[in-house]
């Protein structure tokens, strides 16, 4: 097991998850750790505890390894980091990779007020409701590098979007969370259409793909006090 030392260390590796950092309960996920071609061992840590290791074969000139989690559960959801060893030296820790398990327990309802098709500048609010006890709700936009939002609430949360712009158009889903890394099933999608303005056309996403595997996320700061944490939502984290 890696010995902590603040002396000489190698550059930190890059860690990412494929196909996504959001994994349906029971599905598999690959965690990649990219270090150096000279690395003799990679170690993966989960919530600060040693999780797995791999010793690359010298015959393969690869600077990364893949750790395979065969069945994602609430027990494997959380924060992962990796290290690598080259010679006698260990690298610094990678940035944290936060894996979320979805598809737990129940499915929330999502709706939008006043309606799914609104004019540019109109005030819009999303509502997410989940019957089972939860304390936090997440609203996600498909295919967006726009922000994910979260709100605290018992059974229901509202997400005021303010006066909408064209950037708000797209398809949304919400989740209830049982902790930061264990989420409900996704709601049915709600597509927000924006009309009026210069182009005066209903703008919905042209890409019909709605698989979570293709979503990109960013976490915004809001009144709940959560700071923006791009490492959580980017598939790859570095620097």
């Amino acid at each position: 097991q890696r010995i902590n030392t603040e002396k000489e260390t190698l550059p930190k590796p890059i860690i990412w998850a494929k196909p996504s950092i959001m994994v349906t309960n029971g599905n598999s996920v690959n965690i990649w750790c990219q270090g150096a071609q000279s690395a003799s061992e990679y170690q993966l840590y989960f919530e600060g505890s040693f999780f797995a290791l791999e010793r690359p074969k010298p015959s393969r000139s690869m600077n990364k390894v893949r750790f395979f989690i065969s069945q994602m559960t609430s027990h494997t959801a959380g924060i992962y980091t990796c290290f690598y060893q080259s010679g006698e030296l260990w690298s610094k820790s990678s940035n944290p990779l936060k894996l979320v398990v979805t598809g737990l327990y129940d499915t929330p309802n999502l709706w939008v007020y006043p309606r799914p098709e609104v004019t540019l500048g109109e005030n819009v609010t999303f509502f997410c409701q989940l019957k089972t006890a939860t304390s936090k709700f997440f609203l996600l936009k498909e295919r967006g590098s726009n922000h994910i939002q979260n709100k605290y609430g018992n059974i229901q949360a509202e997400f005021p979007m303010g006066p909408v712009t064209r950037a708000h158009r797209g398809t949304y889903r919400c989740f209830g969370s049982y902790n930061d890394y264990a989420w409900s099933f996704p709601s049915e999608p709600v597509t927000l259409l924006i009309t009026g303005g210069v182009e005066n056309s209903s703008l919905a996403p042209t890409d019909p793909t709605s698989s979570l595997d293709y979503w990109e996320f960013d976490l915004s700061t809001n009144e709940s006090g959560l700071q923006k944490d791009s490492a959580f939502w980017d598939h790859t984290t570095q620097n």
Partner: nanobody, 127 residues
Framework: EVQLVESGGGEVQPGGSLRLSCAAS????????MGWFRQAPGKEREFVAA????????YYADSVKGRFTISRDNAKNTVYLQMSSLRAEDTAVYYC????????????????????WGQGTLVTVKP
Amino acid sequence: EVQLVESGGGEVQPGGSLRLSCAASGRTFASAAMGWFRQAPGKEREFVAAISRSVGDTYYADSVKGRFTISRDNAKNTVYLQMSSLRAEDTAVYYCAAVVPTYGNNIYVHSAAYNYWGQGTLVTVKP
């Protein structure tokens, strides 16, 4: 579905040896990474040793390094734990566990990674 059945446990004197076996059912054994864990009375389950699916890379807990050896026979769908120089503190129920399927030469140390477990076999070390 994978079923794991441990055998070979028993009572032994300090300094003695035992070999535990874990027989796996199904055709997925060759694609499984395997591990041994143990749980002493009143204590949490702890990692003992693990082996990768293909080339047989191994990893051991510091407490057993140099005394225990993990190995596998893919033709027999069996993983072994050879235990020697046994001590009183090795007394525990020993569990075999599998990660099915897995990839490459991953060696899993954390119990959360394992998705199949045996029922355990008791090892008692006493004079």
